[in-house]
């Protein structure tokens, strides 16, 4: 913490300027009112301060604003935004998508994911929804930004807006993400036909149920390996060989190079070999012909 | 672009750890598996394994079982492989390269990280 | 694991000769799982050929890929300056994917 002293007359501040760059830590802790920094934040960040000097001013304004800063501060912090942690974001209020702009750009190249990540989660409760604005917004200034946010807060785009969202915004999110935005997608492009509803849905289908992914096998949509990977282990292992096949087309070839990963281990294991074989991959690992599969599952669902 | 840039080169001593980092940009990222292969002074290839940076899923050469972890991290579209237990003759250029997942072959390499195994 | 040999380990040849490289494999590789691969001193390797035959994007009409089974070719019909190199076979028919010892092609 900076040390309390009183401010010679003659370093007395009276506009934020350059002359501040030759101040001492305490000199600025003394010298500098936080009102006065409060109103002045628009010329802070033209001023070339150490990292030293920024910590002073995060700390005055800190002392004026203990429950979050106002909005006409945040959206002027500049590189000042590189020094908030993410409770000191948790306080904020903040509405303006200029404001997100700005501080996304501010952001870039510095490691500072928990930080954007809190500020899009305060702009989505300041503005009530994930409206299109701001998913256009992430999509421009921070690709992959998109998968931050929780699934609560996911809930709250409407389908409308996922027209918006593109392959590369979806790369980060994790299954329970997905599995929120699946719905949501199918329901956007349910009026197009196979082969464009399948472009569409491409990236959503991490979140896609068994029933929804046998729907695709009859759909000669012919599905990549990367996109099958990405299905929920849940999703794929009901599926039979032949819908297998079907679902990947002339890419099912790819299953022997991905044999030994998960879900396609999974799924292979709960095969009939003499089924895998009828690939003609030389695929591995299924059930021996002639064994009787019991599901212990049901019996101790009944018990 | 496509690209991918490894991280500079290490002299490590024997029993060491070394960790090289392979960052992809121009594509995307989870839409490939990132397989690591070394190749000793004078020597050819050598394919250690990959990991599916969707999943995480990892697959290792089993002559490198045990030494070698694979990780990655989505938000910085990296990838990282770390061997342990270094001997004089892990002495070589790590490649990582990319493999279109359900696809065998790689048609981006890095640059190639030199790890040096020296008392 | 399936081990890759190649032959000749050093190919002499002339510009605008042509070259066939060998792969043989110990046992049966699925013809879709090979591919051949450059490599110049100092350089990353570069991928030529996919699934057998098939010619990476960039790769100019004078390679050319063949074979099944356990027996591969690489053909370039008329060598140019910037072709001498190392050429490696590789398999992803089997774990682990394994890589022949490599053939140079060197300037007689």
């Known amino acids: 913490d900076v040390e309390r002293t009183t401010c010679p007359p003659e370093k007395e501040v009276h506009e934020i300027d350059e002359s501040l760059i030759f101040y001492k830590k305490r000199e600025l802790e003394a010298c500098v009112d936080a009102a006065l920094l409060a109103a002045q934040m628009d010329r802070v960040d033209a001023i070339p301060f150490t990292y030293e000097q920024l910590d002073v001013l995060k700390h005055k304004l800190d002392e004026l604003y203990p429950q979050g800063y106002p909005e006409s501060v945040i959206r002027h912090l500049g590189h000042l935004f590189l020094k908030m942690s993410p409770e000191d974001i948790r306080k904020w209020n903040v509405t303006s998508l200029e404001t997100l702009k700005a501080l996304l750009k501010v952001s870039k190249g510095h490691e500072m994911s928990a930080q954007v990540a809190t500020l899009i989660d305060r702009v989505v409760v300041g503005r009530g929804q994930l409206d299109k604005d701001t998913v256009d917004t992430l999509t421009a200034f921070c690709p992959g930004c998109l998968c931050s946010l929780s699934p609560e807060r996911l809930s709250s785009v409407p389908p409308s807006v996922i027209g918006a969202v593109r392959p590369q915004d979806l790369d980060t999110c994790g299954p329970r993400q997905l599995d929120v935005l699946y719905p949501k997608a199918r329901l956007a492009f349910q009026n197009m036909s196979g082969s464009e509803y399948f472009v569409k849905i491409r990236p959503f289908l991490g979140g896609a149920p068994t029933e929804d992914v046998k729907a695709l096998s009859q759909q000669n949509v012919s599905m990549d390996l990367a996109t099958f990977m990405k299905l929920r282990r849940e999703a794929v292992l009901p599926l039979t060989v032949a819908e297998v096949q079907k679902l990947l087309g002339p890419h099912v070839e790819g299953l022997k190079v991905e044999e030994q990963h998960s879900p396609v281990r999974d799924w292979i294991l709960k095969q009939r070999q003499d089924d895998l074989d009828t690939l003609g991959l030389g695929l591995q690992g299924g059930i021996p012909n002639g064994y009787l599969i019991l599901d212990l599952s049901v019996r101790e669902a009944l018990s | 672009e496509v690209q991918l840039v490894q991280s500079g080169a290490e002299v490590k001593k024997p029993g060491a750890s070394v960790k090289v980092s392979c960052k992809a940009s121009?594509?995307?990222?989870?839409?490939?598996?990132m397989d690591w292969v070394r190749q000793a002074p004078g020597q050819g290839l050598e394919w250690m394994g990959d990991?599916?940076?969707?999943?995480?899923?990892?697959i290792y050469n089993q002559k490198f079982q045990g030494r070698v972890t694979m990780t990655e991290d989505k938000s910085t579209s990296t990838v990282y492989m770390e061997l342990s237990s270094l001997r004089s003759e892990d002495t070589a250029v790590y490649y990582c390269?990319?493999?279109?997942?359900?696809?065998?072959?790689?048609?981006?390499w890095g640059q190639g990280t030199t790890v040096t195994v020296s008392s | 694991e399936i081990v890759l040999t190649q032959s000749p380990a050093t190919l002499s040849l002339s510009p605008g000769e042509r070259a066939t490289l060998s792969c043989s494999a110990s046992?049966?590789?699925?013809?879709?799982?090979l591919s051949w691969y450059q490599q110049k001193p100092g350089s990353s390797p570069r991928l030529l050929i996919y699934?057998?035959?098939n010619l990476a994007s960039g790769i100019p009409a004078r390679f050319s890929g063949s074979g099944s089974g356990t027996d591969y070719t690489l053909t370039i019909s008329s060598l140019e300056p910037e072709d001498f190199a190392v050429y490696y076979c590789?398999?992803?028919?089997?774990?682990?994917?394994?890589f022949g010892g490599g053939t140079k092609v060197e300037i007689k």
């Open positions: 390269a990319r493999r279109r997942i359900g696809t065998g072959y790689f048609d981006v």
């Open positions: 121009g594509y995307t990222f989870t839409d490939y598996n």
């Open positions: 990991i599916n940076p969707s999943t995480g899923g990892t």
């Open positions: 046992s049966s590789v699925i013809s879709s799982y």
């Open positions: 699934r057998t035959s």
């Open positions: 590789h398999q992803w028919s089997s774990f682990p994917y394994t």
